[in-house]
Amino acid sequence: EEELQIIQPDKSVSVAAGESAILHCTITSLFPVGPIQWFRGAGPARVLIYNQRQGPFPRVTTVSETTKRENMDFSISISNITPADAGTYYCIKFRKGSPDTEFKSGAGTELSVRAKPS
């Protein structure tokens, strides 16, 4: 089976306050089985932004139908962006288990927030 890669094609995304930000993430293999999660930041202080198996996440919508078993696009849209949303976002694949364990991370996408146009 093909080794899983997590592709975050954008090093950075710049969005005006109040707009929506699309953060792209695709995977190249359906294995191992387990959910995708998005985090802002790295390490112990990272913040969960989206978990395929949990919810709801009111400001986050998935770009594709992630409930379909064959889906490999886990891009997300975050609405009503504020300066507090700035940071580096990581798309991370977890291996199913009790508990799920982190398997592989994308390279990250840095979200910067521009002032709202006046």
Partner: antibody
Framework: DVQLVESGGGVVRPGESLRLSCAAS????????MSWVRQGPGEGLEWVAG????????WYADSVKGRFTISRDNSKNTLYLRLFSLRTEDTAIYYC???????????WGLGTLVTVSS | EIVLTQSPGTLSLSPGETATLSCRAS??????LAWYQQKPGQAPRLLIY???SRATGIPDRFSGSGSGTDFTLTISSLQSEDFAVYYC??????????FGGGTKVEIK
């Protein structure tokens, strides 16, 4: 006019270090991801490293991972590349390149020559 | 890593002729492909991005086509200043970004 001016190249021995700089002018430096691309003598182009617009995300080619460090100082409109544990195969012209809205390079500097020789 | 294979390695043509350069990707890169021109002693110059869009200031004798894995750069009615080395580059899949090995267009 967009200008990218590299400096810091020179002749070093294997195992030594070097710091390359790229001074940017004529555009909003902090609005662009940046990369370093190198070209060995008589060879083709090889992407080396890239950095997001605020510096939160860095990417490296496997050939330099763990040996080179890309960074930027947006207050000085300057991009850097630290080269550690240099090898003879690192001998090349190192170009600083501005990334457009996608990861291709719309402006390049003239390059700085790094020669690694015993 | 996506490998880009350019062919031919060298193209010998006369001014006024048409040059057809090929770039083949080892995986689907959609339309995420750029072409650059490099003359001796100079930095590369962006010619084409997104497979077929001309960069600012590039004459319309340069055109790009293709998507997926097969791409073509066509230079119609070659001028003396067009004799150079041409590189393709794929992007959009995150690291590593890769270049083809280049095609040299030389005067016959």
């Amino acid at each position: 006019d967009v200008q990218l001016v590299e400096s810091g190249g020179g002749v070093v021995r294997p195992g030594e270090s070097l710091r390359l700089s790229c001074a940017a002018s004529g555009f909003a430096f902090s609005d662009h991801d940046m990369s370093w691309v190198r070209q060995g003598p008589g060879e083709g182009l090889e992407w080396v490293a890239g950095i997001s617009l605020r510096g939160g995300v860095t990417w490296y080619a496997d050939s330099v991972k763990g040996r080179f460090t890309i960074s930027r100082d947006n207050s000085k409109n300057t991009l850097y590349l630290r080269l550690f544990s240099l090898r003879t195969e690192d001998t090349a012209i190192y170009y600083c390149a501005r990334e457009s809205w996608n990861t291709f390079f719309d402006y390049w500097g003239l390059g700085t020559l790094v020669t690694v020789s015993s | 890593e996506i490998v880009l294979t350019q062919s031919p390695g060298t193209l010998s043509l006369s001014p006024g002729e048409t040059a057809t350069l090929s770039c083949r990707a080892s995986q689907n890169v959609r339309s995420n492909l750029a072409w650059y021109q490099q003359k001796p002693g100079q930095a590369p110059r962006l010619l084409i991005y997104d497979a077929s869009s001309r960069a600012t200031g590039i004459p319309d004798r340069f055109s790009g086509s293709g998507s997926g894995t097969d791409f073509t750069l066509t230079i119609s009615s070659l001028q003396s200043e067009d004799f150079a080395v041409y590189y393709c580059q794929q992007y959009g899949n995150g690291p590593p970004l890769t270049f083809g090995g280049g095609t040299k267009v030389e005067i016959k």
